[in-house]
C-alpha cells in the first residue's frame, strides 16, 4: 500500500517517501527504488536555510554600497546575508533593502531615541524648562539655565528653542 | 521503453581525450540524470560519475581532474570528456540511467593506444 | 571512498547446489533515512551486468526466486538456493548510499 503522508524531513513522490535535502543543499534527484534522494551543496553566494526539495538554491542578498548597505553578517550555505546601513543611515524597511539618513530633530525638539542602523531618530518637543537651539539628531533637550544658582536673575524668558537670558540683580541705591 | 546507446571512437591515443556519446529513449533527460561506469577488460565496475537532470554533476575523486560529463537536453544525449588518459582507461564504458538500474546500455569498448 | 570486499573471488558449484557470496563494506551502508542501498549485479559472459536484487533483499522484477539477499549494517551476503546453468557469470555487489558509489571486485561463479 503506498503511503499518503511521510515523516518528518520527508515528501512524498511517486507513490514513495523521499527524504528531503538538508539545509545548505538542493535537490539534485528524488528517491528512486534503488537510491536516496540525492543533494548537492549550494554554491558559493547561495545558501538555502530549510529542509527542503528546491531544485535551486537563493543568492546571497547583495548590500548594495550605493544605497548605503553594509554587510552586518556574512551569509553561509545555510543563512542569508544580513545587510544594515552605513554610520548615519538606517534601514527603510525590516528587510533592510536601501537606506536613508538620520533625522535630525529640528530647534524646539531634542533626540528620544538616537537612531541605529535598523531605527530612525525618536524626537520629542522641549517641555517647558527645556530647549533646543540645533538641529540635530544627537542632541537632546537641556534645561534652561538656572540663573538663581549663579546668583543671576532671569533677563529674558527661555522658550523650547532658547535658554533663558541671565543677569545681573538690580542694586538698591 | 528505457534504452541507452554508448558510441565513440574505439581507438584513443595515450594523452589525447576520450570523447563518448550516450543516446538515451524511454524517459527524459531534463527530469532524470545519468550516470557513466566502465569495467577494465577483466576487471571490476567503476563508476565514473553523472549528471543530474538540472545539469549539476558528480565525479569520482579518482577521475576528477581529468573528466567532464555534459549533456543536451534537445538530443537525448549526454557526453564524457576523459582527458590525458593512458593505458590504465581501456575499458568498456557504460551509461546508466538514475533509477532505471536495470538497464545498461551495450557499453562501447574504448582502447588507448599508440 | 566505501571499498567494497567480496568474497570468495571464484566459486565452483555443482549444478543443483546452493552456492553464497559474501560482501563486506567498509562502512555502513544505512543511510539516514534507515534505507540501505545494497545491490546485486550478475554480468553474465559477454554481456552487460543486470540487476538483481537492490535494497539488500528486494528481488527485482523477473528474477528468480532462487536469488536472495540478506545482510544489513556492512555485511551483506548473496545466496542462490540451486545453481542453474544460466546462473554462470561474475556477481557484483554495489553500494549506492554514498558518493562516489563503488562496487566490489566480483565474484565469478563458474560449474564444477
Known amino acids: 500500500e503506498p503511503p499518503t503522508a511521510c515523516r518528518e524531513k520527508q515528501y512524498l513522490i511517486n507513490s514513495q517517501c523521499c527524504s528531503l535535502c538538508q539545509p545548505g543543499q538542493k535537490l539534485v534527484s528524488d528517491c528512486t527504488e534503488f537510491t536516496e534522494t540525492e543533494c548537492l551543496p549550494c554554491g558559493e553566494s547561495e545558501f538555502l536555510d530549510t529542509w527542503n526539495r528546491e531544485t535551486h538554491c537563493h543568492q546571497h542578498k547583495y548590500c548594495d554600497p550605493n544605497l548605503g548597505l553594509r554587510v552586518q553578517q556574512k551569509g553561509t550555505s545555510e543563512t542569508d546575508t544580513i545587510c544594515t546601513c552605513e554610520e548615519g543611515w538606517h534601514c527603510t524597511s525590516e528587510a533592510c533593502e536601501s537606506c536613508v539618513l538620520h533625522r535630525s530633530c529640528s530647534p524646539g525638539f531634542g533626540v528620544k531615541q538616537i537612531a541605529t542602523g535598523v531605527s530612525d531618530t525618536i524626537c520629542e518637543p522641549c517641555p517647558v524648562g527645556f530647549f533646543s537651539n540645533v538641529s540635530s539628531a544627537f542632541e537632546k533637550c537641556h534645561p534652561w539655565t538656572s540663573c538663581e544658582t549663579k546668583d543671576l536673575v532671569v533677563q529674558q524668558a527661555g522658550t523650547n528653542k532658547t535658554d533663558v537670558v541671565c543677569g545681573p540683580q538690580d542694586r538698591l541705591r | 521503453q528505457v534504452q541507452l546507446q554508448e558510441s565513440g571512437p574505439g581507438l584513443v591515443k595515450p594523452s589525447e581525450t576520450l570523447s563518448l556519446t550516450c543516446t538515451v529513449s524511454g524517459f527524459s533527460l531534463p527530469t532524470s540524470g545519468v550516470h557513466w561506469i566502465r569495467q577494465p577488460p577483466g576487471k571490476g565496475l567503476e563508476w565514473i560519475g553523472v549528471?543530474?537532470?538540472?545539469?549539476?554533476?558528480n565525479y569520482n575523486p579518482s577521475l576528477k581532474s581529468r573528466v567532464t560529463i555534459s549533456k543536451d537536453n534537445s538530443k537525448n544525449q549526454v557526453f564524457l570528456k576523459l582527458s590525458s588518459v593512458t593505458a590504465a582507461d581501456t575499458a568498456v564504458y557504460y551509461c546508466?540511467?538514475?533509477?532505471?538500474?536495470?538497464?545498461w546500455g551495450q557499453g562501447t569498448l574504448v582502447t588507448v593506444s599508440s | 571512498d566505501v571499498v567494497m570486499t567480496q568474497s570468495p573471488l571464484s566459486l565452483p558449484v555443482t549444478l543443483g547446489q546452493p552456492a553464497s557470496i559474501s560482501c563486506r563494506s567498509s562502512?555502513?551502508?544505512?543511510?539516514?533515512?534507515?534505507?540501505?542501498?545494497l545491490q546485486w549485479y550478475l554480468q553474465r559472459p559477454g554481456q552487460s551486468p543486470g540487476l538483481l536484487i537492490y535494497k539488500v533483499s528486494n528481488r527485482f522484477s523477473g528474477v528468480p526466486d532462487r536469488f536472495s539477499g540478506s545482510g544489513s549494517g556492512t555485511d551483506f551476503t548473496l545466496k542462490i538456493s540451486r545453481v542453474e546453468a544460466e546462473d554462470v557469470g561474475v556477481y557484483y555487489c554495489?553500494?549506492?548510499?554514498?558518493?562516489?558509489?563503488?562496487f566490489g571486485q566480483g565474484t565469478k561463479l563458474e560449474i564444477k
Open positions: 546508466l540511467g538514475h533509477g532505471h538500474f536495470d538497464v
Open positions: 562502512q555502513s551502508l544505512v543511510h539516514s533515512s534507515g534505507n540501505t542501498y
Open positions: 549528471i543530474w537532470a538540472g545539469g549539476d554533476t
Open positions: 554495489s553500494q549506492t548510499t554514498h558518493v562516489p558509489w563503488t
